[in-house]
C-alpha cells in the first residue's frame, strides 16, 4: 500500500481541506521536473525561472548566463537551441501547434561572438522543423515541405528537395499518420554523429484519401481542415529513405538507400533510423501486417556516393504471438565497435529483455532475464549499460534504472535507484551527459517528485535540482486520497489495480465506485506515480472509490498478457474490466448500485462496451472522444492489433467489435458521449455514428461537443468538460452540489 | 576536355620504390575518386585501390595492403601512387582513372598509362 | 574476391555481324537498386574505354550499337553491327565489392 504524502495527526485534521474541483483546473497541485540540456560531459543548459539561458558546469561549480532574457523577450522566443560549436543560439517564437508532435515557428539566429542577430539571409517564415548540426553550425530546416541547408547561419541556404507540396509530398517532417502513429516525432530528419551526412525520409501521401472536417471559426462560412489520413485497409504513405552529404551537397545529391527486399515485395513502413558512425547508417523497416522487422545496417561507399545495405547486415525481428515489438519496435544501442547492438525484444518465455546481437539475430546474447520487463536502454558506454526495468519487488508499475557492467566478466548488475528514496521514488527515468559522465533521476513518484543530479561513476547524488517544496508545502493542508497498488489473480490472469480512497475510507462503509480505463494495447494505467488531479479530487472531495484496472493486452508483464488482444480489439480489455469490477464488490465496500465507468480515446471505446455489456453492473458512464469502429482509425495503429478489414483476413471482428453493434445494450445505462468536432485523431465520425445508431434504436443519451477542439479537449474545453462530467457523475451517483 | 596525363616510364631495381604521378585537368579535381589500375604484359587488369581528393579517403586491394601508397596534391590536382618493396612481377602499365560521376565504380577517363619495369 | 569469367575468350566475327559476349559473377553483383557491372574496350597500345556502366547504361560518347544487359550473376554485352574500329578486348568489371575485379577480357578479332 502507497499511502501519500505522509499524513498528519488527527489533531490537525480540522485545519485540513479537501481538494476541490478549482484545484484541479487552476493546476494549483502542479509538479515541476528537471531535465538538463546536456551540452558536454559535464555541463548542461537550463532556463531560470526569469527565463535567462543559463551554463551550469558540474565540475567547476560555475554557471553563467549565456542568453539574457531581455534577448529573449525582444524576439518573444519560447524556446532556444545553442549551436554545438557554441557561437549561435536559436531563438524560436510564433509557436503554432499543428498535430500531437508538430508545430509551426519563426526562428531568428543570435550571434553570441558578437551579441547581435544574425542579418542577412534570414529564415523564412514559418518554418515547420529546424536543427543544428551535431558538431558546428550547420543548419537543416524546413520549409513548405521541402529540405534546406545552411552551411553557416549567415549564408544563403541550398535547397535539398524541391518536390515538397502541402498534403502531397513532405519532405524531413511526417505526415499525419507517421507523426502520429509510427515516429512519435515532429522531424524526419537526422544529422550523422558529426555531421557529414543528413538523412531524411520522404512521405507521399499522394494517393491516400483523405478525412475532411468544418473548423467553424468565427467567420461566414466554416474552412474545411483536410489531412490525408489513412484508416485501417486503406492506402498507406509511400516512405523513401534518402541521405546527402552536406560537405558537397550538389555533388551526387541526395542518394536513396535500399528497402531491404523482403520487405519491398508488399506494402511497407519505415520505423526508424539510427546512425552508427559518419559512415554507417541503421534503418529499420516494417511490413504494413506488422508482425515481421528488419534492422538493416547500410554502409556509405565513396565509390558509389550512395550506401550499400549487404542482406548479410540484415537483422529480423518476427513475432509469431502478436505483433513485432511493444507499442513501437524498440530502436537499436550500438556499442563502440559500432556493428553490435543492444536491443530489446521478446525472450523464449515471451517477455522484453535485452538481447547483444552481435552477427545474427538468431545468436543473440540475453542480457537480462526473469519475469518482468526490460523497458528502455538509456545508454550504452565503454563499460557500462543504463536501463529501466520493472524487476524491483516484482511490482509492474514502478520503474527502476539499472547498471550493468559490461566490460566485466561476468557482466554485474546494480540497481542505481532502487533504495535511494524507497517510499517517495519507485518510478524513474534518467537523463545521461556525454559518455555518461553525468545523469539526471527524474523521480515521478509515488510521492512528490524529485529531480537529482548524479556521478555516472559512482552513482553518487551530487546535488537536488528540483525537489517540488513549495508544492509540499501547499499539499500539508490537503486531505488528499489514499493510494493502493495490489493485483487480483483471476483464472491464471493477474489484474493489477490501483485504488483511490477517500481520506476517511472506512471499509465498513459503501462508497460509489468509479473506474477510469485506458486500456489500449501496450498501454499501462496502474503505475506508482504522483498525481493530483480530477479522480483525486473525486476521491478526496466527493468520496468516490476510483479505480484503475490494467487488464489483458497491457504491457509490462509479458507477452501473454500483451498479446491476447491480437486480432480480436474490444473483447478482454472490457472482460477484465468487469472481472475487476465483481472482484472489488467482493470486497464489501463497494455500492454496487453506484458504479460508473469513464475513459477517454480508446478508453473511451472500452468505457462504451463496458456499459454496453449486458452485465447490468454500471449505472452510468462516460465516453470522451471514443473509438467506436476501428474500420474509423489510423491504418498504422489498428493493423497493428487487428489485422486488416478484408474478409480474408479480420473483416468479421472489425464489424464484431464496433460500439454501433451494440446500441440497444445502452438502454439500461446512463451514458454520457464527448468528442471534439475538430478531433484530427479520433474522427467526431466516431461519435457521430454511436450517436445514429443511438437514435436509430430510440436509446435516450446526453452528448456534449466541443467546437474546433481537437483531441485532447484543451483551454476553456478542459474546464467545461471536467464540470460537466462531474455534474454527471454526482447526478448518477446521487451526490448533493 | 577531362584528361589524365600520367608521368613516363620507370626502370626500377627489385626492392626499390617507384612513384608514378597523375595530373588532372578539365574537371574540379577534389570531387572524383581516382583508381589505380595496373596490366601485366599479355595479362588482363588488376585494381590497386583509389583516393578520394577531396575528403582524403583511402581503399587498398588487399593484396598490395602495407606496400602502396597514394597521395594527391590538390593545389596541383594530381595524384601519386607509390609502391614500395618492387619485384619482378609488379612489372606492368599502371594506370590511373578518373571515377565516374554515375557510375558507382565504372572508370570514365583513363590516363594513357605509365609503363614500370623491375629488372635486375 | 568476386571472380569474373568471360566467354568465349576468343570471338571471330566479321564486320557487320552480331556480337555477344558474355561475363558470369561467381556471386550477385546487384542490389535492388543497381548493377555493379561495367564494359571496357581496350587496343592494342591503348588505355582501356568505358562503354556500358551499370550493366546497361551507355556511357557519352559511345555508339549506340553498344549495349548491355543482365542483372545478378550473368550479364551480356552486345554490338549490334560491327564496325572494323569495334575489334579489340574487352572486359567486364564488377565494383559491388572489394577488390574491384575484372574478368580475363574477351577477344573479338575480323574473321
Known amino acids: 500500500i502507497v499511502l501519500r504524502p505522509s499524513r498528519v495527526h488527527n489533531s490537525e485534521e480540522n485545519t485540513m481541506r479537501a481538494l476541490t474541483l478549482k484545484d484541479i483546473l487552476n493546476g494549483t497541485f502542479s509538479y515541476k521536473t528537471f531535465f538538463p540540456n546536456w551540452i558536454s560531459g559535464q555541463e548542461y543548459l537550463h532556463q531560470s525561472a526569469d527565463n535567462n539561458i543559463v551554463l551550469y558546469n558540474i565540475e567547476t561549480g560555475q554557471s553563467y548566463t549565456i542568453l539574457s532574457n531581455r534577448t529573449m523577450k525582444s524576439v518573444n522566443a519560447s524556446n532556444y537551441g545553442l549551436s554545438p560549436d557554441r557561437q549561435f543560439v536559436y531563438l524560436e517564437s510564433d509557436y503554432s501547434k499543428l498535430w500531437r508532435y508538430s508545430y509551426t515557428a519563426t526562428y531568428y539566429i543570435y550571434d553570441l561572438s558578437n551579441g547581435e542577430f544574425v542579418r542577412g539571409n534570414e529564415l523564412p517564415r514559418p518554418i515547420q522543423y529546424l536543427c543544428w548540426s551535431p558538431v558546428g553550425s550547420k543548419l537543416a530546416y524546413v520549409y513548405q515541405n521541402n529540405i534546406y541547408l545552411k552551411q553557416r547561419p549567415g549564408d544563403p541556404p541550398f535547397q535539398i528537395t524541391f518536390n515538397g507540396r502541402e498534403n502531397k509530398i513532405f519532405n524531413g517532417i511526417p505526415d499525419w499518420v507517421y507523426e502520429e502513429e509510427m515516429l512519435a516525432t515532429k522531424y524526419a530528419l537526422w544529422w550523422s554523429p558529426n555531421g557529414k551526412f543528413l538523412a531524411y525520409a520522404e512521405f507521399n501521401d499522394t494517393d491516400i484519401p483523405v478525412i475532411a472536417y468544418s473548423y467553424y471559426g468565427d467567420e461566414q462560412y466554416p474552412r474545411t481542415i483536410n489531412i490525408p489520413y489513412p484508416k485501417a485497409g486503406a492506402k498507406n504513405p509511400v516512405v523513401r529513405i534518402f541521405i546527402i552529404d552536406t560537405t558537397y551537397p550538389a555533388y551526387v545529391g541526395p542518394q536513396e538507400v535500399p528497402v531491404p527486399a523482403m520487405i519491398a515485395s508488399s506494402d511497407y513502413y519505415f520505423s526508424w533510423l539510427t546512425w552508427v558512425t559518419d559512415e554507417r547508417v541503421c534503418l529499420q523497416w516494417l511490413k504494413r501486417v506488422q508482425n515481421v522487422s528488419v534492422l538493416s545496417i547500410c554502409d556509405f561507399r565513396e565509390d558509389w556516393q550512395t550506401w550499400d545495405c549487404p542482406k548479410t547486415q540484415e537483422h529480423i525481428e518476427e513475432s509469431r504471438t502478436g505483433w513485432a515489438g511493444g507499442f513501437f519496435v524498440s530502436t537499436p544501442v550500438f556499442s563502440y565497435d559500432a556493428i553490435s547492438y543492444y536491443k530489446i525484444f521478446s525472450d523464449k518465455d515471451g517477455y522484453k529483455h535485452i538481447h547483444y546481437i552481435k552477427d545474427t539475430v538468431e545468436n543473440a546474447i540475453q542480457i537480462t532475464s526473469g519475469k518482468w520487463e526490460a523497458i528502455n536502454i538509456f545508454r550504452v558506454t565503454q563499460d557500462s549499460l543504463f536501463y529501466s526495468s520493472n524487476e524491483f519487488e516484482e511490482y509492474p508499475g514502478r520503474r527502476n534504472i539499472y547498471r550493468i557492467s559490461i566490460g566485466s566478466y561476468p557482466p554485474s548488475k546494480k540497481c542505481v535507484t532502487c533504495h535511494l528514496r524507497k517510499e517517495r521514488c519507485q518510478y524513474y527515468t534518467a537523463s545521461f551527459s556525454d559518455y555518461a559522465k553525468y545523469y539526471a533521476l527524474v523521480c515521478y513518484g509515488p510521492g512528490i517528485p524529485i529531480s537529482t543530479l548524479h556521478d555516472g561513476r559512482t552513482d553518487q547524488e551530487i546535488k537536488i535540482l528540483e525537489e517540488n517544496k513549495e508544492l509540499e508545502n501547499a499539499l500539508k493542508n490537503i486531505q488528499l486520497p489514499k493510494e493502493e497498488i495490489k493485483k487480483l489473480e483471476v483464472d491464471e490472469i493477474t489484474l493489477w489495480y490501483k485504488m483511490i480512497l477517500p481520506p476517511q475510507f472506512d471499509r465498513s462503509k459503501k462508497y460509489p465506485l468509479l473506474i477510469q480505463v485506458y486500456g489500449g494495447p501496450c498501454s499501462q494505467s496502474v503505475r506508482s506515480v504522483f498525481a493530483v488531479n480530477w479522480i483525486s479530487y473525486l476521491a478526496s472531495k466527493e468520496g468516490m472509490v476510483i479505480a484503475l484496472v490494467d487488464g489483458r493486452g497491457t504491457a509490462f508483464q509479458g507477452d501473454k498478457l500483451l498479446y491476447a488482444v491480437y486480432r480480436k480489439l474490444g473483447v478482454y480489455e472490457v472482460e477484465d474490466q468487469i472481472t475487476a469490477v465483481r472482484k472489488f464488490i467482493e470486497m464489501g465496500f463497494i455500492d454496487e448500485k453506484r458504479i460508473a465507468i469513464w475513459g477517454w480515446s480508446y478508453g473511451g471505446y472500452v468505457s462504451s462496451l463496458a456499459l454496453a455489456s449486458g452485465t447490468g453492473l454500471f449505472k452510468c458512464g462516460i465516453a470522451v472522444a471514443p473509438v467506436s469502429s476501428w474500420e474509423y482509425y489510423a491504418s498504422v495503429y489498428t493493423e497493428r492489433f487487428m489485422g486488416l478489414p478484408t474478409k480474408d483476413d479480420n473483416l468479421e471482428h472489425y464489424k464484431n467489435s464496433t460500439v454501433m453493434a451494440r446500441a440497444e445494450y445502452f438502454r439500461n445505462v446512463d451514458y454520457l458521449l464527448i468528442h471534439g468536432t475538430a478531433d484530427d485523431n479520433v474522427h467526431f465520425q466516431n461519435s457521430a455514428q454511436i450517436a445514429k445508431a443511438l437514435v436509430n434504436a430510440q436509446v435516450d443519451f446526453q452528448a456534449m461537443w466541443y467546437s474546433d477542439q481537437n483531441h485532447g479537449l484543451s483551454g476553456l474545453s478542459t474546464n467545461h468538460l471536467y464540470t460537466h462530467m462531474t455534474h454527471f457523475l454526482k447526478q448518477c451517483f446521487s451526490l448533493s452540489d | 576536355q577531362v584528361q589524365l596525363v600520367q608521368s613516363g616510364a620507370e626502370v626500377k631495381k627489385p626492392g626499390a620504390s617507384v612513384k608514378v604521378s597523375c595530373k588532372a585537368s578539365g574537371y574540379t579535381f577534389t570531387e572524383n575518386i581516382i583508381h589505380w589500375v595496373r596490366q601485366a604484359p599479355g595479362q588482363g587488369l588488376e585494381w590497386m585501390g583509389w583516393?578520394?581528393?577531396?575528403?582524403?579517403?583511402?581503399k587498398y586491394a588487399q593484396k598490395l595492403q602495407g606496400r602502396v601508397t597514394m597521395t594527391t596534391d590538390t593545389s596541383t590536382s594530381t595524384a601519386y601512387m607509390e609502391l614500395r618493396s618492387l619485384r619482378s612481377d609488379d612489372t606492368a602499365v599502371y594506370y590511373c582513372?578518373?571515377?565516374?560521376?554515375?557510375?558507382?565504380?565504372?572508370?570514365?577517363?583513363w590516363g594513357q598509362g605509365t609503363l614500370v619495369t623491375v629488372s635486375s | 574476391e568476386i571472380v569474373l569469367t568471360q566467354s568465349p575468350g576468343t570471338l571471330s566475327l566479321s564486320p557487320g555481324e552480331r556480337a555477344t559476349l558474355s561475363c558470369r559473377a561467381s556471386?550477385?553483383?546487384?542490389?535492388?537498386?543497381?548493377?555493379?557491372m561495367h564494359w571496357y574496350q581496350q587496343k592494342p597500345g591503348q588505355a582501356p574505354r568505358l562503354l556500358i556502366y551499370?550493366?546497361?547504361n551507355l556511357e557519352s560518347g559511345i555508339p549506340d550499337r553498344f549495349s548491355g544487359s543482365g542483372s545478378g550473376t550473368d550479364f551480356t554485352l552486345t554490338i549490334s553491327r560491327l564496325e572494323p574500329e569495334d575489334f579489340a578486348v574487352y572486359y567486364c568489371q564488377q565494383s559491388r565489392e572489394y577488390p574491384y575485379t575484372f574478368g580475363q577480357g574477351t577477344k573479338l578479332e575480323i574473321k
Open positions: 551499370g550493366a546497361s
Open positions: 556471386q550477385s553483383v546487384s542490389t535492388s537498386a543497381y548493377s555493379y
Open positions: 582513372a578518373r571515377h565516374g560521376g554515375t557510375g558507382r565504380g565504372a572508370m570514365d577517363y
Open positions: 583516393i578520394h581528393p577531396g575528403s582524403g579517403a583511402i
